[in-house]
């Protein structure tokens, strides 16, 4: 049984059952407007890809990584440091499957900080590990300017002022 700050997820022989009832197929709204259906079965199959990773009690495992969903709110930089202090980093989203997993485990529909900000040095959106965002996968709604940081809401990525206070997600 995997316990997150959001919902309980359980993989049983390739199918997920969870405390909060979702339909078997979730709609993923990709930011360019296209849609892709991702089943709970897909989520469980990909999550079981690396069973060797074991997360700490308050962290949720998915695809060989561990995720922690905050309950409080901080600015982007304070959220960034909070994750660092726990030898983790703000969420880096690699693909739509991961986005779907994150969305299913978010309790509320408000903005949540992720590890993406606009760096004036590179003049581009950059993940906290230094890699650029893949514009073919993700589209960021809002201005690309200094002091812009990214937050997710309902599977979309938004540009927000970094000093705004939102919940956040750590990952390792």
């Amino acid at each position: 049984l995997l316990v997150s700050q959001g919902v309980l997820l359980k993989c049983q022989k390739g199918s997920c059952s969870n405390a909060t009832q979702y339909e078997d197929t979730g709609d993923l709204k990709v930011n360019n407007g296209t849609r892709r259906n991702i089943s709970n079965k897909d989520l469980c199959a990909s999550r079981s890809a690396d069973q060797t990773v074991l997360c700490q009690s308050e962290w949720l495992k998915y695809q060989g990584k561990c995720y922690w969903f905050s309950n409080e709110m901080k600015s982007w930089s304070d959220s960034y440091v909070y994750c660092l202090e726990r030898k983790s980093h703000l969420l880096i989203i690699h693909d739509q499957l991961e986005m779907a997993f994150i969305q299913k485990n978010l309790r509320q529909l408000n903005y949540v900080w992720i590890g993406l900000n606009f760096t004036s040095l590179k003049m581009t959106w950059t993940w906290v590990d230094g890699s650029p965002i893949d514009s073919k996968i993700f589209f960021i709604k809002g201005p690309a300017k200094e002091n812009s940081c990214a937050a997710i809401k309902e599977s979309k990525i938004f540009s927000e002022t970094c000093s705004s206070v939102f919940k956040w997600i750590c990952q390792y």
């Epitope: 074991l54 700490q56 962290w59 202090e85 030898k87 390792y172």
Partner: antibody
């Protein structure tokens, strides 16, 4: 050479206070790692006291038993971390070590000081 | 706070023996566990971190295993310099981090 040196230990009366220092050389107290205090009573095991984050936040965390009586702080200009101990008791008699957590993704205290002895006695 | 429970508290062994020390966390700590060796009058020395990763310079006769709540330190063939006290240390990544030690295991000469 990267090292930590503790100082400030000595004999103190029950109910008294003491401030221990942990000075760094070979690196600076600013980075993505924790500086921690650990103690060891005579003939006993290691006991974690608490830590301070070397980064800008300066976050601190303490063992439940240490909260309230023990305070960890840092002075970046002196490259030193402090352990303020109040309301000392006989059972606080121990060698006090400071240790540095690595800046990597793993939890490990890879740098230790030699320790300073605190004796609480009347 | 998490609690670390180490066993046995002491073990008598001879040179060449295989020695196993266990450590149990009160809740899952993933693989966030380190092992230290301490000799009288000295500061602890890091042996293993990440539950199974050998610190640089540590002999390969030392090995660590486990994840979640149960961990093991093994010395495959005890050497004279290995007689010491061994401690496990867990790391808690929660909102209130903590780094508790186990009670220690003294490895003595039989």
């Amino acid at each position: 050479q990267v090292q930590l040196v503790e100082s400030g230990g000595g004999v103190v009366q029950p109910g008294g206070s003491l401030r221990l220092s942990c000075a760094a050389s070979g690196f600076s107290f600013s980075g993505n790692y924790w500086i921690c205090w650990v103690r060891q009573a005579p003939g006993k095991g290691l006991e974690w006291i608490g830590c301070i984050y070397a980064g800008s936040s300066g976050s601190t965390c303490y063992a439940t038993w240490a909260k309230g009586r023990f305070t960890i702080s840092k002075d970046l200009s002196k490259n030193t971390v402090y352990l303020q101990m109040n309301s000392l008791r006989a059972e606080d008699t121990a060698v006090y070590y400071c240790a540095r957590d690595t800046g990597s993704g793993y939890w490990k205290y890879n740098i230790w000081g030699r320790g300073t002895l605190v004796t609480v006695s009347s | 706070d998490i609690q670390m429970t180490q066993s046995p508290s002491s073990v008598s062994a001879s040179v060449g023996d295989r020695v196993t020390i266990t450590c149990q966390a009160s809740q899952s700590i993933g693989r966030d566990l380190a092992w230290y060796q301490q000799k009288p009058g000295k500061a602890p020395k890091l042996l293993i971190y990440g539950a199974s990763i050998l610190e640089s310079g540590v002999p390969s006769r030392f090995s660590g295993s486990g994840s979640g709540t149960d961990f093991t330190l093994t010395i495959s063939s005890l050497q004279p310099e290995d007689f010491a006290t061994y401690y496990c240390q867990g790391a808690d990544r929660s909102s209130t981090p903590s780094w508790p030690f186990g009670q220690g295991t003294k490895v003595e000469i039989k």
